[in-house]
């Protein structure tokens, strides 16, 4: 049974750029018909990843994934049951809170970001390594890249493959 | 600041498996020096995270980090600080709670395994998912495949990229 | 020009029915969440409820919940709210709101609202 | 649930003057945090989110600061066409939540 699918593409980028894997960071930006630099701005956001090492991808991973299935993303129409998340009742959409997680993590402050998080009641361990990557894509990325990288989440956002 | 990694080879070994990667996998299955046995073992296993799409990564990616991020793996001695952590004071051991939900996966039955899951406090969503997973697994696996895929797990446990 | 245009308010009895909709045009409808939010007469603003894009994400407050449902038809522009179980503290105007931004968010345009009164 | 807490209830001001309305939230709204100013009958107008973003078309006079729990609305000169009551609104949540208003009245 293929379970329902929230917005697949935005997880296929998110996954590709969090395990540093390039070539298929590129398969799932060409998709999107991703521009030379929204693709920039993304392998800039995935250098960071690299950089902090494997634990950072799990636990960053976990911020995602915690965020994907707190309550704030069971909205009431979505709380029922498994049948009908096979269904697919959760739609395409991306939830809410994800977008407003990835929203403050290119736009935000490190503390606003990292309060978004804590309020998912991430572990010290989790918080310290958001607040890891949020500072290093603060100091890699320029404006126009973290512009860049919105303007590819909208084409993401509103992607037939979303 | 680089953070601690506990037994990165058995997390880089699940991401492969669990995000269909098989490039990935086959790289991260010669570092242990994986038999051809081992390897078509886990491709198995691989083959059922694919099946179920990405939702079924994100999902499992959440056991895996919830369980990895859980009070089971974070004993007194690593609870303290963030600090601490960078100290590598979690070792590069594999969590035991981590452990025996993969031993579980492969040997015991459905139920049992979900129930393990269960204990972590995940959503239906999530339960659902683990026992699509796991039905999936003991239809493709035979008895010998799960040995052998225990054997690489020991190698895992056991290397010193662990 | 961004309009929303509430109707289906009126006089109902405690325990009673009601099913408000909100017209909306001047927009691309399915790119934002919609929300309903209600007023007292002489009293603040109250949010009832949201509702995102493709239906996916609900959210209703506490002291509705169990009696309102909230709806939207993208194919008609339209948003919906079923009251069941009125009650007097019920009684207020609701207004219509598309939400700024389509995460839960503030509210950039207003409905002018309709009145909503539950009385014996 | 959050709770917005304005003050002062109500504010006599005259034409010119330096307004501020402050916004207290029972716990940390970070930064999601909008104003929105309401005339009698009509319906509310946003002024500003994200605590400090001015909305397209609002007049600069209006000004917007604070994070976490604190919050104010500042209003430069106070111009007639500025006399309403207005609310704050924490979005932090999925369950918005509104102060109970400050009425800016003439002196």
């Known amino acids: 049974v293929k379970m329902a699918e929230t917005c697949p593409i935005f997880y296929d980028v998110f996954f590709a750029v969090a395990n540093g894997n390039e070539l298929l960071l590129d398969l799932s930006l060409t998709k999107v018909n991703a521009t030379e630099p929204e693709r920039t701005a993304m392998k800039k956001i995935q250098d960071c990843y690299v950089e902090n090492g494997l634990i950072s991808r799990v636990l960053d991973g976990l911020v995602m994934t915690t965020i994907s299935s707190s309550k704030d993303c069971m909205g009431e129409a979505v709380q029922n049951t498994v049948e009908d998340l096979k269904l697919n009742t959760l739609g395409r959409e991306i939830c809410p809170a994800v977008k407003r997680g990835v929203d403050l993590f290119l736009t935000g402050t490190p503390d606003e970001y990292v309060e978004q998080v804590a309020q998912y009641k991430a572990l010290p361990v989790v918080l310290e390594n958001a607040r890891i990557l949020k500072n290093c894509v603060d100091a890699k990325m320029t404006e126009e890249d973290k512009e860049n990288a919105l303007s590819l989440l909208d084409k993401i956002y509103t992607s037939p493959l979303c | 600041v680089k953070m601690a990694e506990t037994c990165p080879i058995f997390y880089d070994v699940f991401f492969a498996v669990a995000n269909g990667n098989e490039l990935l996998l086959d790289l991260s299955l010669t570092k242990v020096n994986a038999t051809e046995p081992e390897r078509t073992a886990m491709k198995k296993i691989q083959d059922c995270y694919v099946e179920n799409g990405l939702i079924s990564r994100v999902l499992d990616g959440l056991v895996m980090t919830t369980i990895s991020s859980s009070k089971d793996c974070m004993g007194e001695a690593v609870q303290n600080t963030v600090e601490d952590l960078k100290l590598n004071t979690l070792g590069r051991e594999i969590c035991p709670a981590v452990k025996r939900g993969v031993d579980l996966f492969l040997t015991g039955t459905p139920d049992e395994y979900v129930e393990q899951v269960a204990q972590y406090k995940a959503l239906p969503v999530v339960l659902e998912n683990a026992r699509i997973l796991k039905n999936c697994v003991d239809a493709k696996m035979t008895e010998e495949d799960k040995e052998n895929a225990l054997s690489l797990l020991d190698k895992i446990y056991t290397s010193p990229l662990c | 020009e961004v309009q929303l245009v509430e109707s289906g308010g009126g006089l109902v009895r405690p325990g009673g029915s009601l099913r408000l909709s909100c017209a909306a045009s001047?927009?691309?409808?399915?790119?934002?969440?919609m929300n309903w939010v209600r007023q007292a007469p002489g009293k603040g603003l109250e949010w009832v409820s949201s509702?995102?894009?493709?239906?996916?994400?609900?959210y209703i407050a506490d002291s509705v919940k169990g009696r309102f449902t909230l709806s939207r038809d993208n194919a008609k522009n339209s948003l919906y709210l079923q009251m069941h179980s009125l009650r007097p503290e019920d009684t207020a105007v609701y207004f219509c709101?598309?939400?700024?931004?389509?995460?839960?968010?503030?509210?950039?345009?207003w409905g002018r609202g309709t009145l909503v009164t539950v009385s014996s | 649930d959050i709770q917005m807490t304005q003050s002062p209830s109500t504010l006599s001001a005259s034409v010119g003057d330096r307004v501020t309305i402050t916004c207290r939230a029972s716990?940390?709204?970070?930064?999601?945090l909008a104003w929105y100013q309401q005339k009698p009958g009509k319906a509310p107008k946003l002024l500003i989110h994200r605590a400090s973003s001015l909305e397209s078309g609002v007049p600069s006079r209006f000004s917007g600061s604070g994070s976490g729990t604190e919050f104010t609305l500042t209003i430069s000169g106070l111009q007639p066409d500025d006399f309403a009551t207005y609310y704050c609104?924490?979005?932090?949540?999925?369950?918005?939540?509104f102060g109970q208003g400050t009425k800016v009245e003439v002196k």
């Open positions: 001047g927009f691309t409808f399915t790119s934002y969440a």
């Open positions: 509702i995102s894009s493709y239906s996916s994400y609900i």
């Open positions: 716990q940390s709204v970070i930064s999601w």
């Open positions: 709101a598309r939400e700024g931004y389509s995460a839960y968010s503030y509210f950039d345009f």
């Open positions: 609104q924490q979005y932090n949540t999925y369950f918005p939540t």
